[in-house]
């Protein structure tokens, strides 16, 4: 089948890093500079992605693979293949249309990206707050002291308060 296919389509013999040049009798020609083909049998090479501005090159373009970009310090990638760079904020903040804003009380963000999320509601799991939440950290849930003891002090109720001027019998 492979042999039959190659007889019908000589371009299928062109490996990655080349293209099937119609102008040269379907000879396999190497991709020109700043272009690549990642699969065989291609009739054109794709233009290499250029990492400019807020983007920086993470991996150079080669004849068989596209360049890969990431973001310059102070920014982070968004989208498939880092199609966008978004400004970092500090932990305890989120990015709004007006820039970085502190998380509202009761919410936190432990990363430099993303939105502020509500603190965990420990009581939903029947637990109590062991460590309070902050803008940067979620609460830590755990048992309340009552989970470790049924209570001992009920054995001895507090002594009744004496009225002034009365001595104990």
């Amino acid at each position: 089948f492979e042999r039959t296919r190659s007889l019908q389509d000589p371009c299928s013999n062109c490996p990655a890093g080349t293209f099937c040049d119609n102008n040269r009798n379907q000879i396999c020609s190497p991709c020109p500079p700043n272009s690549f083909s990642s699969a065989g049998g291609q009739r054109t090479c794709d233009i290499c992605r250029q990492c400019k501005g807020v983007f920086r090159t993470r991996k150079e373009c080669s004849s068989t693979s596209n360049a890969e970009c990431d973001c310059t310090p102070g920014f982070h990638c968004l989208g498939a293949g880092c199609s966008m760079c978004e400004q970092d904020c500090k932990q305890g903040q989120e990015l709004t249309k007006k820039g970085c804003k502190d998380c509202c009380f009761g919410t936190f963000n432990d990363q430099k990206r993303g939105i502020c999320r509500p603190w965990t509601n420990c009581s939903l799991d029947g637990k109590s707050v062991l460590v309070n939440g902050t803008k940067e950290r979620d609460v830590v849930c755990g048992p309340s002291p009552a989970d470790l003891s049924p209570g001992a002090s009920s054995v001895t109720p507090p002594a009744p308060a004496r009225e002034p001027g009365h001595s104990p019998q």
Epitope: S128, P145, A146, D147, L148, S149, A152, S154, P158
Partner: antibody, heavy 112, light 112 residues
Framework: DVQPQQSGAELVRPGASVKLSCKAL????????MYWVRQTPVHGLEWIGA????????AYNQKFKGKATLTADKSSSTAYMELSSLTSEDSAVYYC?????WGQGTTLTVSA | DVVMTQTPLSLPVSLGDQASISCRSS???????????LHWYLQKPGQSPKLLIY???NRFSGVPDRFSGSGSGTDFTLKISRVEAEDLGVYFC?????????FGGGTKLEIK
């Protein structure tokens, strides 16, 4: 911080009394009992008693009745233990705890 | 008083080994409310005890999952699946079902 904060080391004379303090942190002091425990190389960990700051209720290990008196001040979230008629046998590290977290301990040395 | 008996007294291990500590009580630790108030603590030199496991088998916040507790009634076990250097110290079992609350004598986990 959530670890109870205890008063510093004490060096006292035999026959004297001492009052140790324990400040609760990170939870509602009046809702739960505070316990006192002592540790010695000979007897290991020994439970002295409990106080419920909300109700004022107390419970004592029979061994420490008359030796220890537990009180609490709700306004400062602080529990106290007074130890009286001290002897060298009372030299120990004394801990307060709500069982999840323990204070750092107060070292009591009774010596002439 | 409820007597808590821990075995062994000393447990020499190699790092990465499994360790198992037994705790037996002189009477059942099942409370009338159905809960079993048996807890495990680790005490490192110069520090206060730290809670590892509460109510037989519940890992406390931040305690690695290599620690597990099991048992019922009067017979309880603490297992450490792969001992790490930070696990070395003295392990205590403790019961808070019956007043006075009591503690085991401790098991020292040390390097072989």
């Amino acid at each position: 911080d959530v670890q109870p904060q205890q008063s510093g080391a004490e060096l006292v004379r035999p026959g004297a009394s001492v009052k140790l303090s324990c400040k609760a942190l990170g939870y509602t002091f009046t809702d739960y009992e505070m316990y006192w425990v002592r540790q010695t190389p000979v007897h290991g960990l020994e439970w002295i008693g409990a106080i419920h700051p909300g109700s004022g209720g107390t419970a004592y290990n029979q061994k420490f009745k008359g030796k220890a008196t537990l009180t609490a001040d709700k306004s400062s979230s602080t529990a106290y233990m007074e130890l009286s008629s001290l002897t060298s046998e009372d030299s120990a590290v004394y801990y307060c705890t709500e069982l999840r977290y323990w204070g750092q301990g107060t070292t009591l040395t009774v010596s002439a | 008083d409820v007597v808590m008996t821990q075995t062994p007294l000393s447990l020499p291990v190699s790092l990465g080994d499994q360790a198992s500590i037994s705790c037996r009580s002189s009477q059942s630790l099942v409370h009338s409310n159905g809960n079993t108030y048996l807890h495990w603590y680790l005490q490192k030199p110069g520090q206060s005890p730290k809670l590892l496991i509460y109510r037989v088998s519940n890992r406390f916040s931040g305690v690695p999952d290599r620690f597990s507790g099991s048992g019922s009634g009067t017979d309880f076990t603490l297992k450490i699946s792969r001992v790490e250097a930070e696990d070395l110290g003295v392990y205590f079992c403790s019961q808070s079902t019956h007043v006075p609350y009591t503690f085991g004598g401790g098991t020292k986990l040390e390097i072989k």
